[in-house]
């Protein structure tokens, strides 16, 4: 988790002087509670946006937006703490909006936005906005949280972001898998324009089960430049196991931009359809 390397992060708007600061996610008001605290944020919205760094790289960011409730507690609102928690790693990053002037009611509802948290493809986050100061230990909570799922690199807009392109998202191998006689599969895919090796992982499963009955890895050496964008054909021999009929083929490249952690592409061959067994014809006809 990190912040986009923007010039200066701003939160000021007409009628409010505000600065964005790094936060330890442990605001002082936790340790020194105040008697009067503001109410919670209203209508917290999280959306996927895209932003360029100063170097011109494109990253997915969480666009966080919320409004204030129209009550007198805005008189005690000193700022907000924005927290993003990556759920699979428990990594948390916070920033603090520090209001340098008092808020006053005006003809429009106060609205705040922040779009500088860089998020990763295919990850889920919990986004929390805490109004400051935080409530006293038994006080009503004054925060709002929402979960936010970032699409993976198959998503059209995500595909062209720097993290996705670095992991090989622009390569479309167009995998085809054909079942041959004598327990064999022919796998065909398009090579990328890089002299790098690939590995094919074949995993076979029984019909309707997720425990594999066979796993086979096949290595494909780096192609020569004249083979770039050509189709590579590989014949894999299956184990002759009864019922081990559903096959998943995964292709992992080793591109220089992602080394041994590149995106995999996969294709699946289903078990052959079993013909419906016809109703047995009775050898006598009932007379009623």
């Amino acid at each position: 988790l990190r912040l986009l390397d923007h010039r200066a992060l701003v939160c000021s708007q007409p009628g409010l002087n505000c600065t964005v600061k790094n936060s330890t996610c442990l605001d002082d008001s936790w340790i020194h509670p105040r008697n009067l605290t503001p109410s919670s944020p209203k209508d917290l919205q999280i959306q996927l946006h895209f932003a360029h760094t100063q170097q011109g790289d494109l990253f997915p960011v969480a666009h966080i937006e919320w409004t204030l409730q129209t009550d007198a507690s805005i008189l005690y609102l000193e700022g907000a703490e924005l927290s993003v928690l990556q759920l699979n790693t428990n990594e948390r990053l916070c920033v603090r909006f520090e209001f340098l002037s008092k808020l006053r009611h005006h003809h429009r509802r106060w609205r705040f936005t922040f779009s500088h948290f860089v998020v990763d493809p295919d990850q889920e986050y919990e986004v929390t906005v805490h109004h400051l100061p935080k409530p006293i230990p038994d006080g009503d909570p004054n925060h709002q949280s929402k979960n936010f799922l970032v699409p993976d690199c198959e998503h059209a807009r995500m595909k062209v972001t720097t993290p996705c392109m670095s992991s090989g998202s622009l390569w479309d191998p167009n995998i085809t898998v054909e079942t041959l006689e004598a327990h064999q599969l022919r796998v065909s895919f398009t090579l990328w324009n890089e002299s790098t090796h690939y590995q094919i992982l074949l995993t076979s499963f029984p019909h309707m089960e997720n425990h594999s009955c066979f796993e086979h890895m096949h290595h494909i050496p780096a192609p020569r430049p004249e083979e770039f964008h050509q189709r590579s054909n590989v014949t894999l021999t299956l184990r002759n196991l009864k019922g081990c009929c559903r096959h998943q083929v995964q292709i992992q490249p080793f591109f220089s931009s992602c080394l041994n952690d590149c995106l995999r592409h996969s294709a699946t061959v289903s078990c052959p359809e079993m013909p419906d067994t016809p109703e047995p014809i009775p050898d006598y006809m009932p007379l009623w």
Epitope: Q199, L201, T203, H211, S212, C213, F214, E215, H216, M217, R239, Q250, Q252, N260, D261, R264
Partner: nanobody, 113 residues
């Protein structure tokens, strides 16, 4: 979650032998294909050998006839027996479980007189 730990690396003279081991903890082992890769300084990580769930093996051309990959399912280990070692075999050797792209931390092999 599976973890892979390699051992057995070291310094050996050309023509010598070494036996590398990779021990897996956690996750499924018996049914998983396993592989060895190596990475020489400043080079890309390269395939060395693989052993499939059935025990069938596959080798890079550069090590065929010299290296042998084997597995011991009860001990959850994959071994790489390396004979007739050459200076160009010098690299960090990594164990890999392709199923979930898990890698060990690597073990250094140096072939030098």
């Amino acid at each position: 979650e599976v973890q892979l730990v390699e051992s057995g690396g070291g310094l050996v003279q050309p023509g010598g032998s070494l036996r590398l081991s990779c021990t897996a903890s956690g996750g499924v082992f018996n049914g998983a294909a396993m592989a060895w890769y190596r990475q020489a300084p400043g080079k890309q990580r390269d395939f060395v050998a693989t052993i499939n769930s059935s025990g069938s093996t596959n080798y890079a051309d550069s090590v065929k006839g010299r290296f042998t990959i084997s597995r011991d399912n009860p001990k959850r280990t994959v071994n790489l027996q390396m004979n007739s070692l050459k200076p160009e075999d010098t690299a960090v050797y990594y164990c890999n479980r392709p199923r979930d792209n898990t890698w060990g931390q690597g073990t250094q092999v140096t072939v030098s007189s």
